[in-house]
Interface confidence: medium
């Protein structure tokens, strides 16, 4: 079969938006199945026509209503003849139009008076493409070949830049890039002490506006009174906007404040936030826990615990815990150093412990007291020890 692209030179140049019809002539076949191929892929759309000129001469048409850059490429037609695929000579379709931007100026944030660069690149066809830069509504510099880099020595306020690309088909304007001025960050806010213990405090905050420069770190300053001597200053990388303050003194009033810094410098400090560390739990266990059996039940007594350090704060009440081997157990809280125990089974062994508590919690448990079901009273000692008299 004779196969050729009709009326089409090896290179076909068309303006963007114009229609194109590619004609493929097939001779020597009665029923050719003409396929159009672009850059190696069969064209799947329905913009195709087949016309019999005579019994053995056919013309196929590929019709493009409005060509765009993506239609550019290498086209050919092909037919199957006797199990073999015959292909025509190709035609290169070039789509000409106004320049097409491959690189447009990007938004920037720069320090005042700092030098920076903006880039712009556009392509044809047709070439050459020249670039003209605009600063706001003012043209800056003459045409330069694409690609073009604009070097700016610095700006003192937010400024808009754009580039314009020219070729024989006309001009295209890029996006407008805004060059923002960087500034010091704003003070952080919503500063919260999220967790407190006797010696540690977790702090979280929200960053203020970053001044269009990446926040690099935040400083947490701690004093024992607002404006007092600095006890602690912790510099933390961010994000996250959190900090753990360690080695604080228990049961102490503190204040903290936070500031954050970008490449230009630190923000103002936020307002002081007061907080108080928790005190220490009692360090000592009640001593000399003993029991006295009475007709009405069991009286338990122990020695009063004296605070070892002022950080423990006021002590009391005492917490009493008892358990029996039948599974019965209970706790009761008493203000003094004596408790009347009821509701226990005298026929079963009883184990009793006591601790002293404060605002933080309970101190260590006393040695357990075992009251045997045979005993009339009991003494402190290791579990399961029995004392009789």
């Amino acid at each position: 079969a004779g196969l050729k692209l009709m009326g089409a030179p090896v290179k076909l140049t068309v303006s963007q938006g114009q229609p194109v019809k590619l004609n493929c002539s097939v001779e020597g076949m009665e029923e050719p199945d003409i396929q159009w191929v672009k850059d190696g892929a069969v064209v799947q759309n329905l913009d195709q026509l087949y016309i019999p000129v005579s019994e053995q001469h056919w013309i196929g048409f590929l019709s493009l209503k409005s060509v765009e850059r993506s239609d550019a490429g290498r086209y050919w037609c092909q037919v199957e003849d006797g199990g073999e695929t015959e292909i025509s000579q190709p035609v290169w379709l070039t789509v000409e139009g106004v320049p097409f931007f491959t690189v447009e100026p990007k938004d920037l944030a720069v320090p005042p008076n700092a030098p920076f660069q903006l880039s712009c690149e556009a392509v044809g066809p047709p070439e050459p493409v020249t670039i003209v830069w605009w600063r706001g509504t003012t043209k800056i510099g003459g045409p330069a070949p694409s690609p073009s880099v604009l070097n700016v020595t610095g700006v003192t306020q937010s400024t808009m830049f754009s580039c314009e690309a020219h070729n024989l088909k006309g001009l295209a304007s890029s996006r407008t890039a805004t060059v923002h001025l960087q500034a010091l960050p704003a003070a952080p806010f919503n500063i919260t002490v999220t967790k407190l213990s006797s010696s540690n405090a977790s702090v979280a905050w929200m960053p203020g506006a970053d001044g269009r420069a990446l926040l690099q770190s935040c400083t947490v300053q701690v004093t024992q009174a607002p404006g007092g001597w600095e006890v602690l200053a912790v510099v933390v990388p961010v994000p996250p906007f959190t900090c753990l303050l360690r080695d604080l003194v228990p049961a102490t009033n503190y204040s903290l404040r936070v500031r954050c810094a970008n490449a230009l410098g630190p923000s103002p400090y936020a307002d002081w936030v007061p907080f108080q560390t928790k005190g220490l739990a009692p360090a000592s266990a009640p001593q000399n826990l003993h029991a006295i059996r009475t007709d009405s039940g069991l009286i338990l007594e122990w020695e009063e615990v004296i605070p070892e350090a002022p950080l423990e704060g006021p002590l009391g009440p005492y917490k009493l815990s008892w358990v029996q081997d039948n599974g019965t157990q209970d706790e009761l809280t008493v203000e003094g150093t004596r408790a009347n125990l009821t509701g226990w089974d005298p026929q079963k062994d009883l184990i009793v412990r006591v601790c002293v508590s404060n605002a933080v919690g309970c101190g260590p448990w006393s040695q357990p007291l075992v009251v045997s079901s045979h005993d009339r009273a009991g003494q402190q000692g290791p579990p399961h020890s029995r004392t009789s008299w």
Epitope: E31, N45, L49, I51, V53, S63
Partner: antibody
């Protein structure tokens, strides 16, 4: 003279299968594409699909893909539209359409389309 | 799926110009075709490739396309032009056709 002769009107129950036909005469069948178009009573035209002139591939409209099958027999110059399971909503007039080009001065295409008279399909229980 | 949008109805007096529009996102790249369908008859192609007229179609029928809108114009509409008019084009990928919803032209 170009003619597209379509099969006669048909009444079917929902769930039944059906094939309607369109026989071409007056031109070489393989010169053109055959499309099928549906028109429900009192409604607009809907493009169903097309089979190319060599009966080697088909294209379907999204609403019809999987619901109908378009085929052709080159030896008898006949195109077919087939349903495996009809629904009441398939009640419509179905046109076959010859798509393609004629020669004007031998080389310049002029779009021209011949429509069959239509086949009325009624699906009712 | 792709849609072509037409006004449901257009009314003109005899001798006036009737304009029927068809909008679709792919129309900048795909040709529009126009069909006329009179009551009880099969459709007839009146415009192809946006603006071309098949032989036998009166000169008062013309077509144009701009951006996403195609327009069928009947200059000096006549009573016999009263019919339903359908635009017809391809989806953006070019792998199926679609009709517009149709416009009923009344020539009073």
């Amino acid at each position: 003279e170009v003619q597209l002769v379509q099969s006669g009107a048909d009444v079917k129950k929902p769930g039944a299968s059906l094939t309607i036909s369109c026989q071409a005469s007056g031109y070489t069948f393989t010169d053109y594409w055959i499309s099928w178009v549906r028109q429900k009573p009192g409604k607009g035209l809907e493009w169903m699909g097309v089979i190319n002139k060599y009966a080697s591939w088909t294209r379907y409209g999204p609403s019809f893909q999987g619901h109908v099958t378009i085929s052709a027999d080159r030896s008898t110059a006949t195109a077919y539209l087939q349903w495996r399971s009809l629904e009441a909503s398939d009640t419509a007039m179905y046109y076959c359409v010859r798509s393609g080009g004629l020669t004007s001065g031998g080389t310049i295409p002029e779009y021209y389309q011949h429509w069959g008279p239509g086949t009325l399909v009624t699906v009712s229980s | 799926s792709y849609e072509l949008t037409q006004p449901p109805s257009v009314s003109v007096s005899p001798g006036q110009t009737a304009r029927i529009t068809c909008s679709g996102d792919a129309l900048p790249k795909k040709y529009a075709y126009w069909y006329q369908q009179k009551s009880g008859q099969a459709p007839v192609l009146v415009i192809y490739e946006d603006s071309k007229r098949p032989s036998g179609i009166p000169e008062r029928f013309s077509g144009s396309s701009s951006g996403t809108m195609a327009t069928l114009t009947i200059s000096g509409a006549q009573v016999e032009d009263e019919a339903d008019y359908y635009c017809y084009s391809q989806n953006p990928q070019g792998n199926y056709f679609v009709f517009g919803g149709g416009t009923k032209l009344t020539v009073l």
